[in-house]
């Protein structure tokens, strides 16, 4: 009679993570008598996956009933596959021996490859805000995928970005892989509403890629422009000076009025108006009683935006140009603010 052969018909098996892998194995003869064992890997460091004779293998089930006397099908199923299960599996026939069974013949092996989905990409931006025209870096990471082949793209404002570097680790063979990409983005004043998108495409995802996003509103700082203007008011001895604070982001802003270098009033931007591009405008005003001043007055609007060094704009108020009110002197100075 021909010598027993152990046949593993599948050279390779491809399984999605979470699924069940079927590893096929048949023997060509019932002789010699002895159990079958399944191993992952070969050589002295091989890992026992299933032993027909003894042991507890909760993830493994046999395809046919191995207790039947004439059974020659030793195929197994391994449930809930993870990338860590990847490797070459050998079906090995043992000959009954005393005290131990002796390895008789091994199948050629079946390579189990596991396809695993990448995790949702996580996009992170710079720790500190940056102003328009500066270049900032965004990183995108995704983990746990297999096979290694993966596509990553960056988008901003309807366009694909080209200035990025991507690495897939590890470089050699592994049960699963990670991707890390860094994109460089030049900020513009209109980027408050912009998003940076990282897109990962992988064979396991098929119809829909995975995307991670970062809002540039968390990255950008648009510094304000200041304009100080003077308007006459009905009372001849009063002048209304306004400070227009335009196109700033984020909203955190403190304004100080100085008269000849001395602090007159400090206020915080509260009721602001939002522009279409996401930036804010705010206006503060100061009502100056000219009759209280003998000399010209230097009025300064000083703005501290988002913890940055203060910027200021000054306006010289010519006292001589305003005739003194003939009636009794009212309060030396009225101040107020008007947010719009």
């Amino acid at each position: 009679e021909e010598e027993l052969q152990v046949i593993q018909p599948d050279k390779s098996v491809l399984v999605a993570a979470g699924e069940t892998a079927t590893l096929r194995c048949t023997a060509t003869s019932l002789i010699p008598v002895g159990p079958i064992q399944w191993f992952r890997g070969a050589g002295p460091g091989r890992e026992l996956i299933y032993n027909q004779k003894e042991g507890h293998f909760p993830r493994v089930t046999t395809v046919s009933d191995l207790t039947k006397r004439n059974n020659m099908d030793f195929s197994i199923r391994i449930g809930n596959i993870t990338p860590a299960d990847a490797g070459t599996y050998y079906c090995v026939k043992f000959r009954k021996g005393s005290p131990d069974d002796v390895e008789f013949k091994s199948g050629a092996g079946t390579e189990l490859s596991v396809r695993a989905k990448p995790s949702a990409p996580v996009v992170s931006g710079p720790a500190a805000r940056a102003t328009p025209q500066h270049t900032v870096s965004f990183t995108c990471e995704s983990h746990g995928f297999s096979p290694r082949d993966i596509t990553l793209k960056w988008f901003k404002n309807g366009n694909e970005l080209s200035d990025f570097q991507t690495n897939v680790d590890p470089v050699g063979e592994s049960v699963s892989y990670s991707i890390h990409s860094t994109a460089k983005v030049v900020l513009t004043r209109e980027d408050v509403h912009s998003q940076v998108i990282c897109e990962v495409a992988h064979v396991t995802l098929q119809g829909d890629p995975l995307r991670g996003t970062a809002n540039l509103s968390e990255t950008i700082r648009v510094p304000p422009t200041l304009e100080v203007t003077q308007q006459p008011v009905r009372a001849e001895n009063q002048v209304n000076v306004t400070c227009q604070v335009r196109k700033f982001y984020p909203q955190r802003l403190q304004l100080t009025w100085l008269e000849n270098g001395n602090v007159s009033r400090t206020e915080t931007a509260s009721t602001v108006t939002e522009n279409k591009d996401g930036t804010y405008n705010w206006m503060s005003w100061l009502l100056v009683n000219v009759s209280a001043h003998r000399d010209d007055v230097k009025l300064t609007c000083q703005v501290e935006h988002d913890g940055q060094p203060a910027v200021s704009k000054s306006h010289d108020l010519k006292v001589s140009a305003h005739p003194k009110e003939q009636g009794s002197n009212t309060a030396a100075e009225n101040t107020g603010s008007n947010e719009r």
Epitope: A16, G18, E19, R115, K117, T151, K153, F155, N157, G158, N159, E160, I197, A201, H202, V203, T204, L205, Q206, G207, D208, P209
Partner: antibody, heavy 120, light 107 residues
Framework: QIQLVQSGPELKKPGETVKISCKAS????????MHWVKQAPGKGLKWMGW????????TYAEDFKGRFAFFLETSASTAYLQINNVKNEDTATYFC?????????????WGQGTSVIVSS | DIQMTQSSSSFSVSLGDRVTITCKAS??????LAWYQQKPGNAPRLLIS???SLETGVPSRFSGSGSGKDYTLSITSLQTEDVATYYC?????????FGGGTKLEIK
Amino acid sequence: QIQLVQSGPELKKPGETVKISCKASGYTFTDYAMHWVKQAPGKGLKWMGWKNTETGESTYAEDFKGRFAFFLETSASTAYLQINNVKNEDTATYFCARGGYGSNYVMDYWGQGTSVIVSS
Amino acid sequence: DIQMTQSSSSFSVSLGDRVTITCKASEDIYNRLAWYQQKPGNAPRLLISGATSLETGVPSRFSGSGSGKDYTLSITSLQTEDVATYYCQQYWNSPRTFGGGTKLEIK
């Protein structure tokens, strides 16, 4: 060459079940998504959803949740669309279409369409 | 859901004309736009993907352009075999959505 061949026309009564097949050839079936698209008589195209041929997951458009189901017979490289409890408004031509992946998720190859008429 | 609007449902054109069909998305679709041609009784045929990439075997008189929300399909010199309905479709997000279609008819 790549081909998607769909099953023949169906005439059904309201309340019955219809199952349409789409047999793929010329490529590795489990590497590409399978989409389904409805076209009512004289109307435009309406995306119904897609099946991940690798994992078996189904994604349905809002209007097609409930009575519609996508199935696979991977060993035969065949995708199926099943409509349960058919209604008159299900009268349409149904197309299967292969979906790409990588940088292009477009529906690149289409079946010839299967006409379904629901009439009492 | 992303709405796709093809402003003209039909066009009456002459052979040899230059034809432009427009498609507008309700939000950015990042060039993930396809154009399909469908003739009566037939399945749709993919002409253009990625807003501008002509599929293999599609005549060079067809071209696609646009970005962001606005896209265009152009046919430089209309031939008899181009008489069909043309659909745009976005594949940036699920659900995939088609435009209502633009039917080309000969004057």
